[in-house]
Interface confidence: low
Amino acid sequence: CRTSECCFQDPPYSDADSGSASGPRDLSCYRISSAGYECSWQYEGPTAGVSHFLRCCLSSGRCCYFATGSATRLQFSDQAGVSVLHTVTLWVESWARNRTEKSPEVTLQLYKSVKYKPPLGDIKVSKLAGQLRMEWETPDNQVGAEVQFRHRTPSSSWKLGDCGPQDDDTESCLCPLEMNVAQEFQLRRRRLGSQGSSWSKWSSPVCVPPENPPQPQVRFSVEQLGRDGRRRLTLKEQPTQLELPEGCQGPAPGVEVTYQLQLHMLSCPCKAKATRTLPLEKMPYLSGAAYNVAVISSNRFGPGPNQTWHIPADTHTEPVALNISVGTNGTTMYWPARAQSTTYCIEWQPVGQEGSLATCNLTAPQDPDPAGMATYSWSRESGAMGQEKCYHITIFASAHPKKLTLWSTVLSTYHFGGNASAAGTPHHVSVKNHSLDSVSVDWAPSLLSTCPGVLKEYVVRCRDEDSNQVSEHPVQPTETQVTLSDLRAGVAYTVQVRADTAWLRGAWSQPQRFSIKVQVSD
């Protein structure tokens, strides 16, 4: 027999045994030109001393063989004795070490068996109703294909799936999407309606992340508020390493996870921008405000579930930093100014109502006044802090108010609203004899004492009605009792108490009249 022809004789070896794990496999045959054909196959196992024979049986029942030696690819023409227009059955027999191994058979019409290409170029991946959708452009002149996919995870072997028939310029496939593990996909194609024809090679790997991006293990901590009114948010984390299937461990775009930090400043709701997203490792400086912080993990399918933490407001207060002057036209606050052209946010909230939304006002950018102070004024009609109750006031500052991470806390303090002078007047002043020349004066705490740092002192005034002589006694804001001594028996006195703030003298309580009885000796 000539080497270019299929030899219609018995092959020069004994019968084949197809039960071996090694041997020839993955035989594919197809037309490569108008009159040229090619068959190729894989050989598993040691190749030394192996001789391959491509066997062919015609529909008439006559069989022939090509001897290819150690080669696993053979080209032949339509003149080689193999019918190309009719169905033929082909297989490979490999002879080695006195035994013969046989490949699975393929039955096909060679002329119609065109070598199909796998999906080439960009395979678009998207999520559709909980499944994975892959889409690609049909290779040139190859419309009409059957498509299969295979997929594996880092811990599983390949599983085969069917994409169904395709008959368009673009082809697509719906595949399973894993929730928590990455997958590697490959696709292959063959001519539609020719069951015996050969499959294309597998496509390049398509690497698909899990539907849920892996969450990093994150712990936040926040430093003390510095003198500049800012505190550093720090993070301790361990990124979650997602194991990848074998074919995705080289350059395999598509499985990346991006982590971002989302900051939401809860305080000062009247400012321009409350939320900012920034890279996870850019640990920002924060003001003393309350924040919600979220870590967002995203992959090619979009963001996954958030992890959210609450960072409470820094409650440290400086009671002396704020001056408040109440006049007939309204109220003005003064505080040490920051740099030129600073915007301030003044926020206030009744104490005990911390759960409700605070009221706030944003100033226009202002420069320090000649005394180095910044100011904010409001009229009585505005109703701001008009009720006679304790308010928590926080002032924030920023030279760039639209940049969330550039706000700082200027001060945090308390203020008693409304007519503090009258509202703070101590009530229930009572006088009790203490000794022959002294009395004990008691009163109920001023409403101002509910407001931390606001009540500077009580003043107790005692007037001798005979001589009109007046004495005043300062009392610590934590005390509600004082002893008046060196009093004279039989003289009428009046006593009054007032409560003072740092910037305001209180109103005297109603005068309380008393006298010490003259002791009559027996």
Epitope: A182, P216, L242, P251, G254, V257, T258, K282
Partner: nanobody, 123 residues
């Protein structure tokens, strides 16, 4: 074409030191966060350390913190890993990896990676 070439691995006794280098080409090195990852024998990939594009943000896994130091020289397109107080459990193939952005946390998956350099810690 991204290329990452690691060197500096070898056999070292417990307690010893090694310095790994990784020369990068095919992309603007100074624009990307870089990482070291490793694959111990018979195990999956482990994250070791990461440094962002400009260098100020550096992070380490708990297993190496205090013993390993990551650094980069953007002028030389080179990433380094100084490994001190090595332990047998540090035995692995060490890979240099490029993230998909300048941010140290832009990716926990290493889409571009070198061929690796073997580090063996044994007495």
């Amino acid at each position: 074409q991204v290329q990452l070439v690691e060197s500096g691995g070898g056999l070292v006794q417990p307690g010893g030191s090694l310095r790994l280098s990784c020369i990068a080409s095919g992309f603007t090195f100074s624009d990307y966060a870089m990482k070291w990852v490793r694959r111990p024998p018979g195990k999956g990939l482990e994250w070791v350390s990461v440094i962002d594009s400009e260098g100020p943000t550096i992070k380490y896994s708990d297993a190496v913190r205090g013993r390993f130091t990551i650094s980069r020289d953007n002028a030389k397109n080179t990433l380094y890993l100084q490994m001190n107080s090595l332990k047998p459990e540090d035995t692995a193939v060490y890979y240099c990896a490029k993230s998909n952005g300048g941010s140290a946390f832009s990716s926990v998956l290493y889409t571009d990676r070198g061929q690796g350099t073997q580090v063996t810690v044994s007495s």
